[in-house]
Amino acid sequence: LNTTILTPNGNEDTTADFFLTTMPTDSLSVSTLPLPEVQCFVFNVEYMNCTWNSSSEPQPTNLTLHYWYKNSDNDKVQKCSHYLFSEEITSGCQLQKKEIHLYQTFVVQLQDPREPRRQATQMLKLQNLVIPWAPENLTLHKLSESQLELNWNNRFLNHCLEHLVQYRTDWDHSWTEQSVDYRHKFSLPSVDGQKRYTFRVRSRFNPLCGSAQHWSEWSHPIHWGSNTSKENPFLFALEA
């Protein structure tokens, strides 16, 4: 019989910015191969994807995911019911809205079914992992001869989001940025009528309802000026 021995080598210790516990192993090997880190993102509080890099496994391994909520009524261990795949190998789990509880500590456990004692557990604060959909329905209003107001909508509670507006003219090489709070409107006080302006917006679940670091995708851009201003000088809808 031609079997193989696994021997770890090296003494580097690793730390991570999440809580991670790895079960010890009873095998001859001194240490168990670490499981990949699970990354979870809650998309507009409609569904959540928890994914891992299946390619880091040295052989094809259908890792399994379980989850629960710590110290809550939802502390029963749940199996993933909707796996995501990469090259026929599990690489993530999708949870639906009813399974998402933003303000309870989410515990996610990854396990190797071939070696059940090889498992890792992470604890995540889901309110810091929300990514809203991109802002929609951008509109521009001309408040005066030189002042423009940009408005937009979000498919989420407005007070939970902050926004970043970028604009530039066709003469600019880079964007000008302006942070906007939950009010989802932005005024540009001084507009040059000879230039064409482009605006776009993105949003983030911060700071009132969570402390997310990730922004939404950018909205579709909206344009104003020169070649569009003749059509309707007072209102401009979305131009993709």
Partner: antibody, heavy 122, light 108 residues
């Protein structure tokens, strides 16, 4: 484009140590999705996988049992290479030795070294 | 360990022929089966991965099929440059990674 360049002597005396090195360009030996393998080929044994090393927050090594008592595979991060040592060689270890990279999620050998014929003879 | 058995071990064929090489695994390996071509003095070259996916740059006359334990490499119309040795390899359960013993394809 990943390239693997092998170096090492082509003639080794019985009972001595066979040493080969595989230089990596276009990738890092510390990649967290690659495994770095040694394979040999002889008329009597065909293609025979010898072992591998890979980095997943620390270094791991797997060896085929047929050679595990005599083999060492070591990464060298400073030179971006990995090496093979086979101790106490016999004429049975005469073969063409290859280094090769495997990556997930498809798990095939896409990149190979050019091969080194090692003859064990006095 | 998973053993890989190729058949035939050698094969004579003519340019234009359709050729089939089989590979059997000692236990199920899903679709984690790769095929390589090797010419004298050269390293093996990947032809087919994941049982049926054609590697970039490989001519479409090469195809692979199978799942579980039984796999096939087919060359639809042999070209002069196809005369070589072909190997299957499993990566489903590693270590160890195991190869078939090879099929030598010769000119008739």
């Amino acid at each position: 484009q990943v390239q693997l360049q092998q170096s090492g002597p082509g003639l080794v005396k019985p009972s001595q140590t066979l040493s080969l090195t595989c230089d990596i360009s276009g990738d890092s030996v510390s990649s967290n999705i690659a495994t770095w393998n040694w394979i040999r080929q002889s008329p009597s044994r065909g293609l025979e996988w010898l072992g591998r090393t890979y980095y997943r927050s620390k270094w791991y090594k797997d060896y085929a049992v047929s050679v595990k008592s005599r083999i060492t595979i070591n990464p060298d991060t400073s030179k971006n290479q990995f090496s093979l040592q086979v101790n106490s060689v016999t004429p049975e270890d005469t073969a063409v030795y290859y280094c090769a990279r495997m990556t997930g999620p498809r798990y095939y050998f896409e990149y190979w070294g050019q091969g080194t014929l090692v003859t064990v003879s006095s | 360990d998973i053993q890989m058995t190729q058949s035939p071990s050698s094969l004579s064929a003519s340019v234009g022929d359709r050729v089939t090489i089989t590979c059997r695994a000692s236990q199920s390996i899903s679709s984690y089966l790769n095929w390589y071509q090797q010419k004298p003095g050269k390293a093996p070259k990947l032809l087919i991965y994941a049982a049926s996916s054609l590697q970039s740059g490989v001519p479409s006359r090469f195809s692979g099929s199978g799942s579980g334990t039984d796999f096939t490499l087919t060359i639809s119309s042999l070209q002069p440059e196809d005369f070589a040795t072909y190997y299957c390899q499993q990566s489903y359960s590693t270590p160890p990674i195991t190869f078939g013993q090879g099929t030598r394809l010769e000119i008739k």
